[in-house]
Amino acid sequence: MAFSGSQAPYLSPAVPFSGTIQGGLQDGLQITVNGTVLSSSGTRFAVNFQTGFSGNDIAFHFNPRFEDGGYVVCNTRQNGSWGPEERKTHMPFQKGMPFDLCFLVQSSDFKVMVNGILFVQYFHRVPFHRVDTISVNGSVQLSYISFQNPRTVPVQPAFSTVPFSQPVCFPPRPRGRRQKPPGVWPANPAPITQTVIHTVQSAPGQMFSTPAIPPMMYPHPAYPMPFITTILGGLYPSKSILLSGTVLPSAQRFHINLCSGNHIAFHLNPRFDENAVVRNTQIDNSWGSEERSLPRKMPFVRGQSFSVWILCEAHCLKVAVDGQHLFEYYHRLRNLPTINRLEVGGDIQLTHVQT
């Protein structure tokens, strides 16, 4: 069962949200829903794994309710009719607080983890492979919905029909209710690996806004900077690294380094003092030749939030900023699995790192 590489995340989707799950649900698929429960309005929210966009066929309805002391309802809807509710009388969510909600699809059940602790298992009532859509509604603001597939032995790349020269995008920041499949880079099957999401919210006073929802304050600590973490299994074709954060108002420079031992295999260095995005490699403390060309204007802006998506392919890294392909960087260090450390430093505040 060789699954393709993971679907690109939906970033800051507006609620209510419906989005396609590319390839449908598969045994071993992990879906992470990251957001904040709104404190002001409503007493419920729901995450639904469903067939199509109508909402008549929901394989798994996960529905926290801030009523009667708080409880969570799990259910299935078939042809518009709800089955018997399964209730969990513990409420792991808090109004006004962020949460990390992970769903693992397995052959017999959905497992649900909330804030790092297994919360509930829900045994399938209908075949899960019918599910092709995730929807979220109710009193919640979303930061992202991400997908992580299981992977097996490498095979020849199954290249997509999208030519590499075309710009490819993250899912758009949704304005409407329904999301069609996003245009993404081709993703290749790869060895089994582990995605690690390192999540903390931005610091006091930092806002993260979307077109459809007013900015919200996140009074939570930022990542310690510089931020250093291991990339489990190193790089390989189809490996993705996702970072988001905010450029400090007085920023001069920041950097994202992918390292192999003492070498910097990939140095991504936005420089506001030079209005440039510099890329380079450092081997044995010696820098190579810089790459600076961009297809459009400098995408990073002082004081503004950003997302960076780095996709490793056989011959190069592809880098997208704010959902738009920006450049390719051909590997100078070609022993990809040894590139196993991410270092981020400089004049930014990180809000999310997924390796």
């Epitope: 969990k88 513990h90 990390d100 992970c102 693992l104 297994l118 509930v120």
Partner: antibody, heavy 121, light 109 residues
């Protein structure tokens, strides 16, 4: 190398307070949940509290609820256990432990060496 | 609260013996069970996570299994360094999201 180092234990009178620290290195506490587990002399392990720093989510054992507060300072990469209204039965070695950072892996993979808290008059 | 009832509380065995320790959860905890080894004056060490997965660096003579709400730690051939106390632990969200078993002390016969 991942390491957890507890500090702050000692002798305190009943009704008193102590703050335990758990300094982490080799990983960021923001990417894990951190748990405090205690062990009274000659007894078994008792879970005390946990924090998931990203969502400021925390939970406590019934025996310490309302008296103990767990927190984390991600800039210092340190977790804390503030213990108030201490009782003789709180006497124990207190361990901090990291719950595995890998999703769907259930287990505390790194532990500190422990710090002894003695509540006695 | 979810209770983890561990048995036996102690056992005596010889080097080379096969040793089995069980934990029964008072309700379903899926596979969210770990096993630890603790020696006097030391912190616990993770042996088995997610009910049946061997933690890195742990000898293969240790194994874990699950049958419904019953969880078993097996040491296939007891070694001198295995004399210690063993604990099971569940992490399934309840009023107390983490609970430990009472422990099993494995002593030399």
């Amino acid at each position: 190398e991942v390491q957890l180092v507890e500090s702050g234990g000692g002798l305190v009178q009943p009704g008193g307070s102590l703050r335990l620290s758990c300094a982490a290195s080799g990983f960021t506490v923001s990417s894990s949940s951190i748990h405090w587990v205690r062990q009274a002399p000659g007894k078994g392990l008792e879970w005390v509290a946990y924090i998931y720093p990203y969502s400021s989510s925390s939970s406590y054992a019934d025996s310490v609820k309302g008296r103990f507060t767990i927190s984390a300072d991600t800039s210092k990469n340190t977790a804390y256990l503030q213990m108030n209204s201490l009782r003789a039965e709180d006497t124990a070695v207190y361990y901090c432990a990291r719950y595995s950072t890998y999703k769907w892996v259930w287990g505390m993979d790194y532990w500190g060496q422990g710090t002894l808290v003695t509540v006695s008059s | 609260d979810i209770q983890m009832t561990q048995s036996p509380s102690s056992l005596s065995a010889s080097v080379g013996d096969r040793v089995t320790i069980t934990c029964r959860a008072s309700q379903s905890v899926s596979s969210a069970v770990a096993w630890y080894q603790q020696k006097p004056g030391k912190a616990p060490k993770l042996l088995i996570y997610s009910a049946s997965s061997l933690y890195s660096g742990v000898p293969s003579r240790f194994s874990g299994s699950r049958s419904g709400t019953d969880f078993t730690l097996t040491i296939s051939s007891l070694q001198p360094e295995d004399f210690a106390t063993y604990y099971c632990q569940q992490s399934y969200y309840d009023s107390n999201p983490i609970t430990f078993g009472q422990g099993t002390k494995v002593e030399i016969k």
